[in-house]
């Protein structure tokens, strides 16, 4: 069965300087491959967070993703700035065989509105 990626909130509002959580769950970890968060779509989309061990300033995972059965890939963005506004997508990839990972499913997106403090 096809993996489903769920982003329950269509939008969230956050005051500049505050933190916000972007929720994402998946129905399966198979086929194996990473899960990444992007802002925007298409060629210009920006990688925001990857659950592959790298450090991303101001962003951390919410759940313990070292659990082998973890299906929660929500993230917390701290010290939000107006530049963080946009639509965020949680994307499941299938690992590539000597080629780049292949995107297999994306969540519906969560629009982040940044309010003036």
């Amino acid at each position: 069965t096809e993996v489903k990626v769920t982003q329950p909130e269509k939008s969230v509002s956050v005051a500049a300087g505050d933190s916000t959580i972007l929720n994402c769950t998946v129905t399966s970890l198979l086929p194996v491959g990473p899960i990444r968060w992007y802002r925007g779509v298409g060629q210009s989309r920006l990688l925001i967070y990857s659950f592959t061990g790298e450090h991303f300033p101001r962003i951390r995972n919410v759940s313990d993703t070292t659990k082998r059965n973890n299906m929660d890939f929500s993230i917390r963005i701290s010290n939000v700035t107006p530049e963080d506004a946009g639509t965020y997508y949680c994307v499941k990839f299938q690992r590539g065989s000597s080629e780049p990972d292949t995107e297999i499913q994306s969540g519906g997106g969560t629009e982040v509105y940044v309010l003036a403090k």
Epitope: V32, G53, D64, T66, R68, N69, R95, S98
Partner: antibody, heavy 118, light 109 residues
Framework: EVQLVESGGGVVQPGGSLRLSCAAS????????MSWVRQAPGKGLEWVAG????????YYPASVKGRFTISRDNSKNTLYLQMNSLRAEDTAVYYC???????????WGQGTLVTVSS | SYELTQPPSVSVSPGQTARITCSGG??????YAWYQQKPGQAPVTLIY???KRPSNIPERFSGSSSGTTVTLTISGVQAEDEADYYC???????????FGGGTQLTVLG
């Protein structure tokens, strides 16, 4: 520099118990899943236990399930392996290993020898 | 018995290329790694996530995958590469970490 130092090995009689420790340093221990891997004399590697970063979830192969218990104390940066009902076939060098994001191993300790013999 | 299959031994002359294969895991549920072990020493991770090399590992070690088979390639083999090489995996479908039985690499001459 990542360092993993095992201790607690020794000689124990069949049916006996032993607790191994692994002291970790050089990285944020509480952020990494950890595992124990063993190697019987002249044999290959065998994974025997894994634990999530927070310590709530543990994993075992059928060969040791119910006899071995992996645990951790993140305040002490220490990983443990409690081994009960030991058998001769549990004789091996036991290594602790740090897990990558996808549960492979990137750093290994030097190992501690466990001998089960009467 | 080991869940992953690799040849018991491989021999190669210095400067040549050695290839060690590993099979047996489902491509959709497995990640692979390669570990080197010299006599009396702990294993050292050469490759993880199929083809990622730790920063302290020489570039002559590389990993690749094709279907259900993964391969460790050692280019320009040196005498100090003589060791046992283990294929290891993580199986997401069973939450386990299987290993291959190991391959003894002999550097001739």
């Amino acid at each position: 520099e990542v360092q993993l130092v095992e201790s607690g090995g020794g000689v124990v009689q069949p049916g006996g118990s032993l607790r191994l420790s692994c002291a970790a340093s050089g990285f944020t221990f509480s952020s990494n899943a950890m595992s124990w891997v063993r190697q019987a004399p002249g044999k290959g590697l065998e994974w025997v236990a894994g634990i999530s970063a927070g310590g709530s979830d543990t994993y075992y192969p059928a060969s040791v399930k119910g006899r071995f218990t992996i645990s951790r104390d993140n305040s002490k940066n220490t990983l443990y392996l409690q081994m009960n009902s030991l058998r001769a076939e549990d004789t091996a060098v036991y290594y602790c290993a740090r897990e990558t994001w996808n549960h492979l191993f990137d750093y290994w300790g030097q190992g501690t020898l466990v001998t089960v013999s009467s | 018995s080991y869940e992953l299959t690799q040849p018991p031994s491989v021999s190669v002359s210095p400067g040549q290329t050695a290839r060690i294969t590993c099979s047996g895991g489902s491509y959709s549920s497995y990640y692979y790694a390669w570990y080197q072990q010299k006599p009396g020493q702990a294993p050292v991770t050469l490759i993880y996530s199929d083809d990622k090399r730790p920063s302290n590992i020489p570039e002559r070690f590389s990993g690749s995958s094709s279907g259900t088979t993964v391969t460790l390639t050692i280019s320009g083999v040196q005498a100090e590469d003589e060791a046992d090489y283990y294929c290891g995996g993580y199986d997401q479908s069973s939450y386990t970490n299987p290993f291959g039985g190991g391959t003894q690499l002999t550097v001739l001459g």
